[in-house]
Amino acid sequence: MKVLQEPTCVSDYMSISTCEWKMNGPTNCSTELRLLYQLVFLLSEAHTCIPENNGGAGCVCHLLMDDVVSADNYTLDLWAGQQLLWKGSFKPSEHVKPRAPGNLTVHTNVSDTLLLTWSNPYPPDNYLYNHLTYAVNIWSENDPADFRIYNVTYLEPSLRIAASTLKSGISYRARVRAWAQCYNTTWSEWSPSTKWHNSYREPFEQH
């Protein structure tokens, strides 16, 4: 049994880091493998993560963490029974993938403005809470070409757009994702999408 693709890990900078790797053949990850991780810190102990299958030869492990600070460094040991398959380390602050925003809502009752709001996925005491920026994706269910991205570079988790920038009388969907420039993170996963019917009063044309 050998590791084909070494574990790569990302942290949500809160309570979970996710490590993925591939074996050289079909593997029952949860019964055959264990990923041991330990914070490099005085009197810390090793903790065990039981991996799950992620495709035939792929494994994924969700490492529970108390919290994360930039100084943290973890040792990682991948075991198959008594055999050490791989040894590495992981610094969560250098591999951050933020949590996805939630509770995306489209408010259509604000005159002819669409107000999209969502929730910041972090509690106020987390460092990332005040460092997230967002991308909002809006697309038409009827027209695949009608697809747009709005970059929200301010901290408030909301976006206002004129309803008239979208076509009237058809359904749209929106989703939002986040990233943090301070840690040069990857983008989060997209939030679940929300759907609404776009309708607005065409301006009365005078001749």
Partner: antibody, heavy 125, light 112 residues
Framework: EVQLVESGGGLVQPGGSLRLSCAVS????????MSWVRQAPGKGLEWVSS????????YYADSVKGRFTISRDNSKNTVYLQMNSLRAEDTAVYYC??????????????????WGQGTTVTVSS | DIVMTQSPLSLPVTPGEPASISCRSS???????????LDWYLQKSGQSPQLLIY???NVAAGVPDRFSGSGSGTDFTLKISRVEAEDVGFYYC?????????FGQGTKLEIK
């Protein structure tokens, strides 16, 4: 009520051995790291060794490395210090102390908040 | 190893007056989580040491509020707002960020 009671001290000749015990009650022993600290006559405090709650992490002062062994028996709520090849400079009062919670991912530290009464080790010919 | 240096080594104080002990570490004892791994202990004559302050500025349970700790990084101070006769003994600072734990030389507080 938290209690730590050391035993096993005594008079021993240079090169001899002693095994100190520290019996603990009043807290969830296996969750906490434990430490040994000593104090030579008329001197200050010197850290000797520490062990994690599960026993997997062990640390020693350079002055005792290779001669002393720390261990624990969580079923007996007891931490031990096996002292071999004793020297005159090991003469001291030995204290055990309750250390940080080590079973969490990041150990949680609240100081060495409880100490035993100490046991005296005298190394002399 | 991190070297801990206390001053003064002897501190005669009049009861009711404040007292202050300094502790300096040769290296930073603050971790990335913002905690200073620096404690203060008091050892009274013939007794085991007792914890006064942990993580730089947290007063241990049962310790009178006349004791306080301050400082960060490498420079720390233990203050007693009004010294009482029962406060006599040796005061030690200790770093527990990394092994080996290291203590200061001790400061002997005595009543004038």
């Amino acid at each position: 009520e938290v209690q730590l009671v050391e035993s096993g001290g005594g008079l021993v000749q240079p090169g001899g051995s002693l095994r100190l015990s520290c019996a603990v009650s009043g807290f969830t022993f296996s969750s906490y790291a434990m430490s040994w600290v000593r104090q030579a006559p008329g001197k200050g405090l010197e850290w000797v060794s520490s062990i994690t709650g599960g026993g997997g992490g062990i640390y020693y002062a350079d002055s005792v490395k290779g001669r002393f062994t720390i261990s624990r028996d969580n079923s007996k709520n007891t931490v031990y210090l096996q002292m071999n090849s004793l020297r005159a400079e090991d003469t001291a009062v030995y204290y055990c102390a309750k250390d940080r919670i080590s079973i969490t991912i990041r150990p949680r530290y609240f100081g060495l908040d409880f100490w035993g009464q100490g046991t005296t080790v005298t190394v002399s010919s | 190893d991190i070297v801990m240096t206390q001053s003064p080594l002897s501190l005669p104080v009049t009861p009711g007056e404040p007292a202050s002990i300094s502790c300096r570490s040769s290296r930073n004892v603050i971790y990335g989580n913002g905690y200073n791994y620096l404690d203060w202990y008091l050892q009274k004559s013939g007794q085991s040491p007792q914890l006064l302050i942990y993580l730089g500025n947290n007063v241990a349970a049962g310790v009178p509020d006349r004791f306080s700790g301050s400082g960060s990084g490498t420079d720390f101070t233990l203050k007693i707002s009004r010294v009482e006769a029962e406060d006599v003994g040796f005061y030690y600072c200790m770093q527990s960020l990394q092994a080996p734990y290291t203590f200061g030389q001790g400061t002997k507080l005595e009543i004038k």
